[in-house]
């Protein structure tokens, strides 16, 4: 049994920021879950993770240097990406995994969202190459 995911086919990131909403055919209330956003056709880069637990505050992090935040709805997670670079224009895939209660569930691969980064060309300073908020 797989969860279905709906995403916008395309989003334009003006001012180097975008909200990407992942809508699921599953209610996340009172579940332990891991929602993640992946970049590229092969989903090789895990951009952002939102971890939710019925007894804890939502935790959001990126291991790959993206500046991201996350918001939880009953059947959705919205990823808010900031400080995007023009060269990060790509296709982004939502993934959802429910760890508890058993059985483990995940999603059918979605069609993805092309995020087209326009606007200000952020120039990394020599000391800090790229966004590094965890």
């Amino acid at each position: 049994n797989k969860i279905l995911v709906k995403q916008s086919p395309m989003l334009v990131a003006y001012d180097n920021a975008v909200n990407l909403s992942c809508k699921y055919s599953y209610n996340l209330f009172s579940r332990e879950f891991r929602a993640s956003l992946h970049k590229g056709l092969d989903s090789a880069v895990e951009v952002c993770v939102v971890y939710g637990n019925y007894s804890q505050q939502l935790q959001v992090y990126s291991k790959t240097g993206f500046n991201c935040d996350g918001k939880l709805g009953n059947e959705s997670v919205t990823f808010y990406l900031q400080n995007l670079y023009v060269n990060q224009t790509d296709i982004y895939f939502c993934k959802i995994e429910v760890m508890y209660p058993p059985p483990y569930l995940d999603n059918e691969k979605s069609n993805g969202t092309i995020i087209h980064v326009k606007g200000k060309h952020l120039c990394p300073s020599p000391l800090f190459p790229g966004p590094s908020k965890p």
């Epitope: 332990e32 891991r34 993770v49 971890y51 935790q59 760890m99 508890y100």
Partner: antibody, heavy 120, light 107 residues
Framework: QVQLVQSGAEVKKPGASVKVSCKAS????????IHWVRQAPGQGLEWMGS????????NYNEKFKDRVTLTVDTSISTAYMELSRLRSDDTAVYYC?????????????WGQGTTVTVSS | DIQMTQSPSSLSASVGDRVTITCHAS??????LNWYQQKPGKAPKLLIY???NLHTGVPSRFSGSGSGTDFTLTISSLQPEDFATYYC?????????FGGGTKVEIK
């Protein structure tokens, strides 16, 4: 309390295989990866691989990929590490440890270790 | 694979000393760096996670700092029970890798 309890010491001949078990208790087995880390005598720590009991996905260190097999039995919350074609330099203490599946970056609980001696 | 280089490999110190151990990553790992303590014949114990966060039950004399490629573990006032080997470990990307260890011995 949260515990990982490993099987006892093993002595094996070169070319043989060894299977080490790791029984988890005190937490939700499917919320954590189980990792295997080894330590040769007087040496440092070497990550061998991990398995996630929820979907049985595995991740192996290339160095061991063709010789190590990680499995789980979720009904008894136990993970297994089998290492084949043993050589003398596989003599080491083998540890199981866990990391959270949602917050995966550190190993917060460790088994007591299983000594595997490979000798002819 | 990301290489983790620890220094020094060993050091001698006295009770009450301030001890600093460094760890260098071969590429940017942001804050995804953990520190462990291991005593002879025992399993490692987590001390610090995500570069600077003290694990539950770990005394406050232990602290961690750094981000990117360079990290430090500091013991502000060495206690008799702190004589052990310390390892750093990167948790940024698989395969997870450890530093070679730093043995803290009694002077």
């Amino acid at each position: 309390q949260v515990q990982l309890v490993q099987s006892g010491a093993e002595v094996k001949k070169p070319g043989a295989s060894v299977k080490v078990s790791c029984k988890a208790s005190g937490y939700t087995f499917t919320s954590y990866y189980i990792h295997w880390v080894r330590q040769a005598p007087g040496q440092g720590l070497e990550w061998m691989g991990s398995i996630y009991p929820g979907n049985v996905n595995t991740n192996y260190n290339e160095k061991f990929k063709d010789r190590v097999t990680l499995t789980v039995d979720t009904s008894i919350s136990t993970a297994y590490m089998e290492l084949s074609r043993l050589r003398s330099d596989d003599t080491a203490v083998y540890y199981c440890t866990r990391s959270h599946y949602g917050l995966d970056w550190n190993f917060d609980v460790w088994g007591q270790g299983t000594t595997v001696t490979v000798s002819s | 694979d990301i290489q983790m280089t620890q220094s020094p490999s060993s050091l001698s110190a006295s009770v009450g000393d301030r001890v600093t151990i460094t760890c260098h990553a071969s590429q940017n790992i942001y804050v995804w760096l953990n520190w462990y303590q291991q005593k002879p014949g025992k399993a490692p114990k987590l001390l610090i996670y995500k570069a600077s966060n003290l694990h539950t039950g770990v005394p406050s004399r232990f602290s961690g700092s750094g981000s990117g490629t360079d990290f430090t573990l500091t013991i502000s006032s060495l206690q008799p029970e702190d004589f052990a080997t310390y390892y750093c470990q990167q948790g940024q990307t698989y395969p997870y890798t450890f530093g070679g260890g730093t043995k803290v011995e009694i002077k």
